[in-house]
């Protein structure tokens, strides 16, 4: 088999026939050096998954539940291409599983016990697996058999396809529990009708069901969605209020050596030649000898799944939680009203050491998880491996796009009511040496630049956003002669000035000596022409305040700020000479952890915050000798956000717009992955 062959896995005679036709038609339109198809027949999807894992096949298309099976060890497959539905302009690759209720019914998600439920069918995704999986740990014990536990949880149900003899309560709202459209309450529309008729109190369906069944907005307005945070939202706000976001149908491949680029090349060419309305003789999305052979008949095309996206991220935390609960049947022993330890995400072993000290002192309230980059930490919080971390505004933006929420803000000014008064923000500045007297904001081209890290506010988003508006392209590595912007591509000129050794060179963590505010300033001191930092950086590292050898003899007066009008000012005049105001760093978490993270962090700062006077003898949460480990060292307290509890509200319209403009220059693989899930 030549190297450019994709071995497609078929699960029936009809699929194998269509696969051979696919193979032959592709041969006729693709040059001999292009990708080709070979067909491998197996007895089931699970056999296909095993065959791909064993390198006996390369690809198969699966629904969400099987994508989960494919991801589990030892299979370790990953999503590589998604089918989309709808139009090319507005492609739909996911649907949302929702809980629909009548507007005047007055209960929340955590009050479903004793209510009457309408399901599309036993064992179906949106109608059963997702809601029951998410409710699993609230079901009365014993939880097996599952149908009995569900029957005892709700006061009555219609769950088509259930065994009405053994579990009559599941068929109480639709006698007989018929498993076809002969049962008026079967399927998506049936489950909604069960709610509409007043038989049930809640219907578990998908987001489009209500629109397909009620064309009139006034009628739709009589219904609401139950959200997982125990609030309600209008039915058109399903993107912010759903039980899970579920991929419709996905091509999977091996995680390592999985030919993902070749599979995409093949399918992209296939959709060009044999996609919707392309060819009479062979149609990719049509199954004359069956239904949904190889691909769904309703699909309109394919989209490449971003490479950063593993199955856990693709399926989403809620879906994975629901399916894992159903499959593994394990629930935490702690009462649900008690907070579990908060798993803090620490960057590299530097932060890990401080985090472990915090953990030991917290007596089990804090646990530590490590990752090498901020984006890896955000991904771990998304999938539940970690719970929280404090982030610069640029990463609050990415975390927000990935569904996380800000929960507390770092405050940097001492005030009587620190915890109740979130600040307006800090200033992003451009610092130069006083001796380089000809340097201004207008002649930075060809100079050597020092940045806190790619994607961070003061060090990157603000200065590069302003620069982009001037030069109208993203080739910042050509604008500056060289620099250190941790997180840049290793061969970029923006890694040339960095000081990390070996693999740590230009890494966006403390293993790179020029990382962060202090690191960027050190880069200016030792090698650079300009450093993009926060307004407190120079005073915090001069006048003997930083005892490190490189900093101990520095004088604030030897540095100046570049103003946007082309002038320069002394460092202390930052209020009249800065690039922009930056939102303070903030702690982010998943929505489901918001209350517990808030509660535990407020307790922790009362124990280890700024009220601790002797930090050499006692653990101090906000101190790490200018390294900004876990939190900025100038943090006075963590403040409540009040109503600024989404990333857009927290960062403010102006900053969100600025980062949005810079998105075309983004190298963030995580941002690409998250915007695939939510464009």
């Amino acid at each position: 088999v030549p190297d450019k062959t994709v071995r497609w896995c078929a699960v029936s005679e009809h699929e194998a026939t269509k696969c051979q036709s696919f193979r032959d038609h592709m041969k006729s339109v693709i040059p001999s050096d292009g990708p080709s198809v070979a067909c491998v027949k197996k007895a089931s999807y699970l056999d296909c998954i095993r065959a791909i894992a064993a390198n006996e096949a390369d690809a198969v298309t699966l629904d969400a539940g099987l994508v989960y099976d494919a991801y589990l060890a030892p299979n370790n497959l990953k999503p590589v291409v998604a089918e989309f539905y709808g139009s090319k302009e507005d492609p739909q690759t996911f649907y949302y599983a929702v809980a629909v209720v009548k507007k005047d019914s007055g209960f929340q998600m955590n009050q479903l016990r004793g209510k009457k439920s309408c399901h599309t069918g036993l064992g179906r995704s949106a109608g059963w697996n997702i809601p029951i999986g998410l409710l699993y740990c609230d079901l009365p014990e014993p939880r097996k058999p599952l149908e009995k536990a569900v029957a005892n949880f709700f006061s009555g149900s219609c769950a088509p396809c259930a065994d009405g003899t053994d579990f009559p309560q599941l068929c109480q709202l639709c006698p007989g529990c018929g498993c076809s459209t002969l049962n008026q309450y079967f399927g998506y529309s049936g489950a909604f009708k069960c709610l509409k008729d007043g038989a049930g109190d809640v219907a578990f369906v998908k987001h489009s069901t209500i629109f397909e069944n009620l064309a009139n907005k006034a009628d739709r307005d009589q219904y609401e969605l139950l959200c997982l945070d125990n609030t309600r939202k209008p039915v058109d706000e399903y993107k912010d209020c759903h039980l899970a976001q579920v991929p419709s149908h996905t091509v999977v491949a091996r995680s390592m050596g999985g030919k993902e680029d070749l599979i995409w090349e093949l399918l992209n060419q296939a959709q060009e030649h044999f996609g919707k309305d392309k060819s009479k003789e062979f149609q990719l999305f049509s199954s004359p000898h069956g239904k949904d052979l190889l691909f769904k008949d309703s699909a309109h095309g394919f989209l490449k799944v971003p490479p950063r996206m593993d199955a856990k991220m693709y399926l989403g935390y809620e879906y994975v939680t629901a399916i894992r609960n159903l499959r593994e049947g394990t629930c935490p022993e702690a009462p649900t009203d008690e907070c579990k330890p908060v798993k803090w995400c620490a960057l590299s072993h530097h932060e890990r050491l401080k985090c472990d000290e915090w953990s030991v002192n917290s007596v089990g309230k804090i646990e530590c998880v490590s990752a090498e980059t901020t984006e890896d930490c955000i991904a771990k919080i998304m999938n539940g491996e970690a719970d929280a971390m404090s982030l610069d505004g640029g990463f609050v933006y990415i975390a927000g796009k990935c569904g996380l929420v800000p929960v507390l803000a770092e405050n940097y000014n001492k005030s009587d009511n620190c915890e109740d008064t979130p600040e307006a923000g800090y200033f992003a500045i451009a610092v130069v040496k006083k001796s380089a007297s000809d340097l201004t904001w207008d002649n930075l081209k060809g100079k050597k630049s020092c940045h806190t890290a790619v994607g961070r506010t003061a060090g990157w988003n603000i200065p590069m956003g302003l620069l982009y508006n001037k030069i109208n392209h993203c080739r910042f590595d050509e604008f500056f002669s060289e620099g250190c912007a941790p997180g840049s591509k290793k061969d970029s000129s923006l890694c040339k000035l960095c000081m990390g050794s070996g693999l740590n060179l230009c890494e966006p963590n403390n293993k790179e000596g020029y990382y962060g505010y202090t690191g960027a300033f050190r880069c200016l001191v030792e090698k650079g022409d300009v450093a993009f930092v926060k307004h407190q950086t120079v005073p915090q590292n001069t006048g003997g305040k930083n005892p490190d050898p490189w900093a101990k003899n520095l004088n604030e007066k030897d540095y100046e700020l570049l103003c946007l009008d082309g002038t320069r000012k002394p460092v202390e005049e930052y209020a009249n000479c800065h690039l922009a105001r930056a939102p303070n760093h903030a702690v982010v978490t998943r929505k489901d952890k918001e209350a517990c993270v808030h509660k535990i962090l407020r307790q922790q700062q009362h124990l280890f915050g700024s009220n601790v006077t002797d930090c050499s003898g006692n653990f101090c949460l906000f101190r790490s000798e200018t390294k900004d480990l876990l939190f900025r060292d100038d943090t006075v307290c963590l403040a409540k956000l009040h109503d600024r509890n989404t990333y857009e509200k927290y960062l403010g319209e102006e900053y969100v717009k600025a980062v949005g403009n810079l998105r075309k220059c983004s190298t963030s693989s995580l941002l690409e992955a998250c915007t695939f899930r939510r464009p």
């Epitope: 072993h349 530097h350 050491l353 401080k354 472990d356 000290e357 030991v360 002192n361 930090c615 050499s616 003898g617 006692n618 653990f619 101090c620 101190r623 790490s624 000798e625 390294k627 480990l629």
Partner: nanobody, 114 residues
Framework: QVQLVESGGGLVQAGGSLRLSCAAS????????MAWYRQAPGNQRGLVAA???????RYADSVKGRFTISRDNAKNTMYLQMNSLKPEDTAVYYC????????WGQGIQVTVSS
Amino acid sequence: QVQLVESGGGLVQAGGSLRLSCAASGSIRPLRFMAWYRQAPGNQRGLVAAETSGGTIRYADSVKGRFTISRDNAKNTMYLQMNSLKPEDTAVYYCAARDLDDYWGQGIQVTVSS
């Protein structure tokens, strides 16, 4: 600046024992937190054992009952007594400490053969 130097590593048979030492020099402040970490190839560095200056001790679940951390403040030295060693204990072991700053040793290899 504080320097940390590990010693006592080496090759040992499964079921055997080793005692690692970590000597701190250059410290003008008490080291408030001292810990042992380990890193096996392809894995992240993980906490093995830690002790605060107040005497609170924590062990990783995988070493509880087999490893013991202790410190001799007079000698500015920390120890890790490792008993009933298993092949999965093979790793580079790092000594780490914190006062206001954080400090790391260079690491020392421990190999447990079966």
